[in-house]
Amino acid sequence: KIGSTENLKHQPGGGKVQIVYKPVDLSKVT
């Protein structure tokens, strides 16, 4: 699923993240 966190391991913060995921947030779609 493109743009989801489905395959993203739960990390304890942004420090070890290798890329920036962008979950599809329908609440922010105007």
């Epitope: 989801s4 966190t5 489905e6 993203l8 739960h10 304890p12 913060g13 942004g14 420090g15 070890k16 993240v17 290798q18 890329i19 920036v20 995921y21 962008k22 979950p23 947030d25 329908l26 609440s27």
Partner: antibody, heavy 120, light 112 residues
């Protein structure tokens, strides 16, 4: 729209436990982390820990290990925090917040807070 | 643990004035892979829940007035309010999310 609904004030006796809900709506519950934050009267914000509802994976502030237990029920889109063996130090407002996990790692939506008073 | 320090602890300014407040972390919050600083700013008005203003040190959250600006990188960060309004009376907190989460002690902004 995104909402995090927390329960009303709790009056609890010292030594007992209290479990408070945070019901999420308006987004995919399993795509975001829920963080919990403590605020004593007139004091600052203190991060307790977080849960990723999809897996149930948790991280805690070392200070709250053994005090707070975080769980999540995917079927009801509700996260819970249980505080055990409460003392007067646990009297505070407790907020839940949606953490924009994987992107900003920032808390973009907050509940209204649950006030806990520990008194005999 | 990452320690966050904010200064000043409080300040009072007149409406229309420019305000800057500082946040320092005990270690760098910059992820060299994503090139992001995992530093956010929150505003908490009296009796309300905190509100996200800035993330990634300088990215304004949707709907936040452009008088609020975040800057800095690594360990030193600043929140600037270019022209303070009466409704900006609040406590402002920085928070790191580089490793776990830690809030600073807050800066209380009063309006003269």
């Amino acid at each position: 729209q995104v909402q995090l609904q927390q329960s009303g004030p709790e009056l609890v006796k010292p030594g007992t436990s209290v479990k408070m809900p945070c019901k999420a709506s308006g987004y995919i519950f399993t795509d975001y982390v829920i963080s919990w934050v403590k605020q004593r009267t007139g004091q600052g914000l203190e991060w307790i820990g977080e849960i990723f509802p999809r897996s149930g994976s948790t991280y805690y502030n070392e200070k709250f290990k053994g005090k707070a237990t975080l769980t999540a029920d995917k079927s009801s889109n509700t996260a819970y925090m249980q505080l055990s063996s409460v003392t007067s130090e646990d009297s505070a407002v407790y907020f839940c917040a949606r953490d924009y996990y994987g992107t900003s790692f920032a808390m973009d939506y907050w509940g209204q807070g649950t006030s806990v008073t520990v008194s005999s | 643990d990452i320690v966050m320090s904010q200064s000043p602890s409080s300040l009072a300014v007149s409406a229309g004035e420019k305000v800057t407040m500082s946040c320092k972390s005990s270690q760098s919050l910059l992820n060299s892979r994503t090139r992001k600083n995992y530093l956010a700013w929150y505003q908490q008005k009296p009796g309300q829940s905190p509100k996200l203003l800035i993330y990634w040190a300088s990215t304004r959250e949707s709907g936040v007035p452009d008088r609020f600006t975040g800057s800095g990188s690594g360990t030193d960060f600043t929140l600037t309010i270019s022209s303070v309004q009466a409704e900006d009376l609040a406590v402002y907190y920085c928070k790191q999310s580089f490793y776990l989460r830690t809030f600073g002690g807050g800066t209380k902004l009063d309006i003269k």
